[in-house]
Amino acid sequence: SETTTGTSSNSSQSTSNSGLAPNPTNATTKAAG
């Protein structure tokens, strides 16, 4: 059977079940020190 679980970040629909956000945010980083 064929599956289509990936999605485009252009899509207004979030990922169905790929497990990844449609346009992941950059993780915030703390300054060293």
Epitope: T3, G6, A21, T25
Partner: antibody, heavy 115, light 112 residues
């Protein structure tokens, strides 16, 4: 049934190059983001690179440690994703998995970088 | 990067007994669409990882309902209501909310 089959691993000297390939079947390849994830005893599982869809202008992301050395690409007509690896380092050693997201994983291909 | 911390490192469980694995993230995994992209994987010995759960609590096709995912924000749990022999392996949490995607260090489930 979804199948992802990686190839191209092997023994490479530090500073050398290698290209990995992953052929997908059982899914509409052109509708999936494709990723490479690697696994090593030292670092565990580590996401390496991602290539998105034609509708996203094939947007690409890399983990910082491989930027400028690795290049991900895809050929939707051949249902294949590639990882070109240059200037390889000992810390690049590991099993490289092709994945669609977190859902489908290949069996992996082993890369060893050693002199 | 988002740090994913799993506990315990090793879990030794008798068949038929419950098991619980914790996963904590250094930042909230709640995405702007209201979904939380937290996944659980199982890597059996000699095999590649296989996903069990996505979006915190959704079971993948074919995964027994003895696997239960829960949590929110930064604190997540995978529970196995009754461990079976086929459950042995290493369990990983992985977040897909923030770039780069990051994995927990793994929890090895052993059968007593």
């Amino acid at each position: 049934e979804v199948n992802l089959e990686e190839s191209g691993g092997g023994l490479v000297q530090p500073g050398g190059s290698r290209q990995l390939s992953c052929v997908a079947s059982g899914l509409t390849f052109s509708k999936h983001w494709m990723n490479w994830v690697r696994q090593s005893p030292d670092k565990g599982l580590e996401w390496v690179a991602q290539i998105q869809l034609k509708s996203d202008n094939y947007a690409i992301r890399y983990v910082d440690s491989v930027k400028g050395r690795f290049t991900i690409s895809r050929d939707d007509s051949e249902n294949t994703v590639y990882l070109q690896m240059n200037n390889l380092r000992a810390e690049d050693t590991g099993i490289y998995y092709c994945t669609t997201g977190t859902d489908y994983w290949g069996q992996g291909t082993t890369l060893t970088v050693s002199s | 990067d988002v740090v994913m911390t799993q506990t315990p490192l090793t879990l030794s469980v008798t068949i038929g007994q419950p098991a619980s694995i914790s996963c904590r993230s250094s930042q909230s995994l709640l995405y702007s669409n209201g979904k939380t992209y937290l996944n659980w994987l199982l890597q059996r010995p000699g095999q590649s990882p296989k996903r069990l759960i996505y979006l915190v609590s959704n079971l993948d096709s074919g995964v027994p309902d003895r696997f239960i995912g829960s949590g929110s924000g930064t604190d997540f749990t995978l529970k196995i209501s009754r461990v079976e022999a086929e459950d042995l392996g290493v369990y990983y949490c992985v977040q897909g909310t923030h770039f780069p995607y990051t994995f927990g260090g793994g929890t090895k489930l052993e059968i007593k």
